[in-house]
């Protein structure tokens, strides 16, 4: 089972139809295709999940029939590889079905888009919503399956099945609410902004995985469990390392089936052991399924035992510090990862692989010299230094946060990023420093305590995103560099960049900063984005434009479009006043 | 740094077997992944099978499922290819190759930073 398959079934197909159930089938179905062909319509996926989900069951009736014994990229494969308009939709991914599995499964993985051309979910009246639900149940929430999975390539699908019966529940109960707006535009914000996060935060493991491979994620994993379960053993943590890489990597590489089973079989297993766990598991395993696993994924960080030694007796004092180095170095580093963490949930978990990557190195280095012992003594005090990096860089910024509040805050990000990364596209410096900048109200708000972990850890998984969305087309060699050396050290690599003293400004071009009445008619947060956009292509012009200058032209920003949207006649009023503006910011600004 | 040998290619009539040796040295601690490539001339470098040091667990290209066997002895630092009912279609150059951080995509050659020199077989009708 797994990426890596022992055959123990017959017919894997329907091995999976019967452990899952045909509605978990279907929608796992649905989601595999929608990632793996972003651009294709609903209703061709509905047709080949229908054909996929038949087939399965014929395979269900006799798993000796023919073709059942074929794999499920084999068997998905083919049905994709079926899709008419796969060359002209897609381009160089349909040369994919000309390979054999399992290169072909990889190949379309290769070809998912973080960023496809789709246009945005505009959210239909509610009475419009009501009676698509009611007319049809199960298209509308195929519909949101489809929609969400096309968007997110990388959505952890088991979750996005807890996602969809979260969504389905919010429309039973709204649609017979006297105030159906009131009952549902709530929850439905708070499912997307969620959803944005749940995506965000997979998209980092799969990018862990694909990059920097199962080492990087088993470590990343031994720290956030054993932070989250002190009380566990090390070999119990292990185990559970051990199963949660395997249903990651399974979902990472497609197999989203057998991820899904393996999620239920982790989920079972940990609710079976919680005494040797956590004692905070009570609640989730009370759960349904799709509940439970979820909330085991949320749950809060166990009491520390009480009592726990020094570290420094095992790790450093010892005399066999080298000897049982040296007799399996990755259980070594494992244990000293294990109990770092458990002693610190008030540390990243980022912080605490650099802190044993550096105890990594000193070992390798000391274990080789006249006196190991002499030599690494000191390792602890190595830890000093990064430990106080992202404790000083918080309380600066949480500070800076509380002063400017969030829209502000972001703000100084973007002018930040921007002199850092000017390549970068527009769309993507605002996104990420939109992101960046809710940092603040997440976790600055936390006791010094939660502070670091929750700031840290959030900030990986943003600059994730500008990972990924730079990859598809990378403009700066700068950008490369940190996101591609290091993993844990990408944050501290982004917030050492200086301005770029090497880029060319922008040429001046003013239809980037003119404006139409149709900015007043948009949301709140739709026209900071306007803002923002242009306070970015502000800087990309004058980088070296100081704060106050660049204050100065955006507060005449704002206060010309409260003006013109106040005016009778606002086209007019966006047409001359604007030119106003632009003249003036030139001027201000030495354009 | 970690040097891969491979040996053991050679000619051989249809139907018949080979096995294919890697030998590895320099570092290759319980993250590592093993893979076996070819390429036939005129057609780019194809995955072939991958094993996992550490477990063992193996993965093959559907054309070459239930006559090849992949294989790795650690204590040997060793990785084979047992080749069975071969094809003429299975005449190439074989490399073997190391990913030290077992990637996500195992088939994709890029992922492998360490390779062999590559040892020919060829099968004739």
């Known amino acids: 089972r797994g990426v890596f398959r022992r055959d123990a079934h017959k017919s894997e197909v329907a091995h999976r139809f019967k452990d899952l159930g045909e509605e978990n089938f279907k929608a796992l179905v649905l989601i595999a295709f929608a990632q793996y062909l972003q651009q294709c319509p609903f209703e061709d996926h509905v047709k080949l999940v229908n054909e996929v989900t038949e087939f399965a069951k014929t395979c269900v009736a006799d798993e000796s029939a023919e073709n059942c014994d074929k794999s499920l990229h084999t068997l998905f494969g083919d049905k994709l590889c079926t899709v008419a308009t796969l060359r002209e939709t897609y381009g160089e991914m349909a040369d994919c079905c000309a390979k054999q599995e399992p290169e072909r499964n990889e190949c379309f993985l290769q070809h998912k888009d973080d960023n496809p051309n789709l246009p945005r979910l505009v959210r239909p009246e509610v009475d419009v919503m009501c009676t698509a639900f009611h007319d049809n149940e199960e298209t509308f929430l195929k519909k949101y399956l489809y929609e969400i999975a096309r968007r997110h390539p990388y959505f952890y699908a088991p979750e996005l099945l807890f996602f969809a019966k979260r969504y389905k529940a919010a429309f039973t109960e709204c649609c017979q609410a006297a105030d159906k707006a009131a009952c549902l535009l709530p929850k439905l914000d708070e499912l997307r902004d969620e959803g944005k996060a749940s995506s965000a935060k997979q998209r980092l493991k799969c990018a862990s995985l694909q990059k920097f491979g199962e080492r990087a994620f088993k470590a990343w994993a031994v720290a956030r469990l054993s932070q989250r379960f002190p009380k566990a053993e090390f070999a119990e943590v292990s185990k559970l390392v051990t199963d949660l890489t395997k249903v990651h990597t399974e979902c990472c590489h497609g197999d989203l089936l057998e991820c899904a089973d393996d999620r239920a079989d982790l989920a079972k297993y940990i609710c079976e052991n919680q005494d040797s766990i956590s004692s905070k598991l009570k609640e989730c395993c009370e759960k349904p399924l799709l509940e439970k696993s979820h909330c085991i994924a949320e749950v809060e960080n166990d009491e520390m035992p009480a009592d726990l030694p020094s570290l420094a007796a095992d790790f450093v004092e010892s005399k066999d510090v080298c000897k049982n180095y040296a007799e399996a170095k990755d259980v070594f580093l494992g244990m000293f990862l294990y109990e770092y963490a458990r002693r610190h949930p008030d540390y990243s978990v980022v912080l605490l692989l650099r802190l044993a990557k550096t105890y990594e190195t000193t070992l390798e280095k000391c274990c080789a010299a006249a006196d190991p012992h002499e030599c690494y003594a000191k390792v602890f005090d190595e830890f000093k230094p990064l430990v106080e990096e992202p404790q000083n860089l918080i309380k600066q910024n949480c500070e800076l946060f509380e002063q400017l509040g969030e829209y502000k805050f972001q703000n100084a990000l973007l002018v930040r990023y921007t002199k850092k990364v000017p390549q970068v596209s527009t769309p993507t410096l605002v996104e990420v420093s939109r992101n960046l900048g809710k940092v603040g109200s997440k976790c600055c708000k936390h006791p010094e305590a939660k502070r670091m972990p929750c700031a840290e850890d959030y900030l990986s998984v943003v600059l994730n995103q500008l990972c990924v969305l730079h990859e598809k087309t990378p403009v700066s060699d700068r950008v490369t560099k940190c996101c591609t050396e290091s993993l844990v050290n990408r944050r501290p690599c982004f917030s050492a960049l200086e301005v770029d003293e090497t880029y060319v400004p922008k040429e001046f071009n003013a239809e980037t900063f003119t404006f139409h009445a149709d900015i007043c008619t948009l949301s709140e947060k739709e026209r900071q984005i306007k803002k923002q956009t242009a306070l970015v292509e502000l800087v990309k012009h004058k980088p070296k434009a100081t704060k106050e200058q660049l204050k100065a032209v955006m507060d005449d920003f704002a206060a010309f479009v409260e003006k013109c949207c106040k005016a009778d006649d606002k086209e007019t009023c966006f047409a001359e006043e604007g030119k106003k503006l632009v003249a003036a910011s030139q001027a201000a600004l030495g354009l | 740094e970690v040097q891969l040998v491979e040996f053991g290619g050679g000619l051989v009539q249809a139907g018949g077997s080979l096995r294919l040796s890697c030998a590895a040295s320099?570092?290759?601690?319980?993250?590592?992944?093993m893979g076996w490539f070819r390429q036939a001339p005129g057609k780019e470098r194809e995955f072939v099978s991958a094993?996992?040091?550490?477990?063992?667990?193996?993965v093959y290209l559907d054309s070459v499922k239930g006559r090849f066997t992949i294989s790795r002895d650690n204590a040997k630092n060793m990785v084979y290819l047992q080749m069975n009912s071969l094809k003429p279609e299975d005449t190439a150059v074989y490399y073997c190759a190391a990913d030290p951080d077992s990637r996500l995509y195992y088939t994709v050659p890029q992922n492998y930073d360490y390779w062999g020199q590559g040892t020919q077989v060829t099968v004739s009708s």
């Open positions: 094993i996992n040091w550490s477990d063992g667990r193996t």
């Open positions: 320099g570092r290759t601690d319980s993250a590592y992944r």
